[in-house]
């Protein structure tokens, strides 16, 4: 079986998937569902997963949810908010994904893959 995916490859694959679901997309992602905004700092991957996992019935982000789980060291389930330190603002999934995508590109360019 293939060995573990290098962190740089995993991050780039996550970036590519976020690009896939946002490119030239004008229809509201996940029917305009709202999710908790997160701080794009330490624990970001778990926080992002905890936020997005509460969106159900949206096939467009299912692969993203699976990929994020590979970056988060603990199991995440709906309604769990241990990494979401600040829950005061809700934004549309599309904006959440766009913000996350920009931050991940920044991390990639800076060589911060973990």
């Amino acid at each position: 079986s293939p060995g573990p995916v290098p962190p740089s490859t995993a991050l780039r694959e996550l970036i590519e998937e976020l690009v896939n679901i946002t490119q030239n997309q004008k229809a509201p992602l996940c029917n305009g569902s709202m999710v908790w905004s997160i701080n794009l700092t330490a624990g970001m991957y778990c926080a992002a997963l905890e936020s997005l996992i509460n969106v159900s019935g949206c096939s467009a982000i299912e692969k993203t949810q699976r990929m994020l789980s590979g970056f988060c060291p603990h199991k995440v389930s709906a309604g769990q908010f241990s990494s979401l330190h600040v829950r005061d603002t809700k934004i549309e999934v599309a904006q959440f994904v766009k913000d996350l995508l920009l931050h991940l590109k920044k991390l990639f360019r800076e060589g911060r893959f973990n």
Epitope: R12, I15, E16, Q23, N24, K26, L102, F108
Partner: antibody, heavy 126, light 109 residues
Framework: EVQLVESGGGLVKPGGSLRLSCAAS????????MSWVRQAPGKGLEWVGR??????????NYAAPVKGRFTISRDDSKNTLYLQMNSLKTEDTAVYYC?????????????????WGQGTTVTVSS | SYELTQPPSVSVSPGQTARITCSGD??????AYWYQQKSGQAPVLVIY???KRPSGIPERFSGSSSGTMATLTISGAQVEDEADYYC???????????FGGGTKLTVLG
């Protein structure tokens, strides 16, 4: 000033090969998605294919009529886009344009193909 | 394969409003882009993301979209607006680009 300059066009026999180049300047080429578009004499614009920036996966997509015959590549160190055309047919005769596609992609914006070169002419004839 | 459909030609008198339509099944979820091409020149982007106008494009150019139809409107068309206009979008996957067949705008001088 943002600029794209195509080169490499010419006359080639059916079944032959040709490589087009597109030299970019005035913007961060490595951030840009790049496209090739062609226009046969007296006809409309036809999308040929596109290559994403490396950070966005470097994915390449092709239009059905050229898939398997044409190859798009890029050299970010040379700020250059390429179109390798093999097994050329008479219907590939056209002006070939390169265009930026999402110069603002890094910032999360989509502008469409907002900068175009002046084109290079490819004639496939026996 | 995915297609975008445009009328082959539209004619207006100077000062009149010209409307060019583009229809495609994926347009409810994918943006439309409009290009102007004058004879012997490279295309120029005049509208992006359905309604947005790049800097340098005159205000008389506007875009709209409803359902499977995108529309380019030129309010108070001028003789210099005479050109071929192409709509562009992507298929539902977003991975493959497609142009409409083009519309020749004639401004009867």
């Amino acid at each position: 000033e943002v600029q794209l300059v195509e080169s490499g066009g010419g006359l080639v026999k059916p079944g032959g090969s040709l490589r087009l180049s597109c030299a970019a300047s005035g913007f961060t080429f490595s951030n840009a998605w790049m496209s090739w578009v062609r226009q046969a004499p007296g006809k409309g614009l036809e999308w040929v294919g596109r290559i994403r920036s490396k950070i966005d996966g470097g994915t390449i997509n092709y239009a059905a009529p050229v898939k398997g015959r044409f190859t798009i590549s890029r050299d970010d160190s040379k700020n250059t886009l390429y179109l390798q055309m093999n097994s050329l047919k008479t219907e590939d005769t056209a002006v070939y344009y390169c265009a930026t596609d999402q110069v603002g992609a890094y910032y999360g914006d989509y502008y469409g193909m907002d900068v175009w070169g002046q084109g290079t002419t490819v004639t496939v004839s026996s | 394969s995915y297609e975008l459909t445009q009328p082959p030609s539209v004619s207006v008198s100077p000062g009149q409003t010209a409307r060019i339509t583009c229809s495609g099944d994926a347009l409810p979820e994918k943006y439309a882009y409009w290009y102007q091409q004058k004879s012997g020149q490279a295309p120029v982007l005049v509208i992006y993301e359905d309604t947005k106008r790049p800097s340098g494009i005159p205000e008389r150019f506007s875009g709209s979209s409803s359902g499977t139809m995108a529309t380019l409107t030129i309010s108070g068309a001028q003789v210099e607006d005479e050109a071929d206009y192409y709509c562009y979008s992507t298929d539902s996957s977003g991975n493959h680009g497609v142009f409409g067949g083009g519309t020749k705008l004639t401004v009867l001088g």
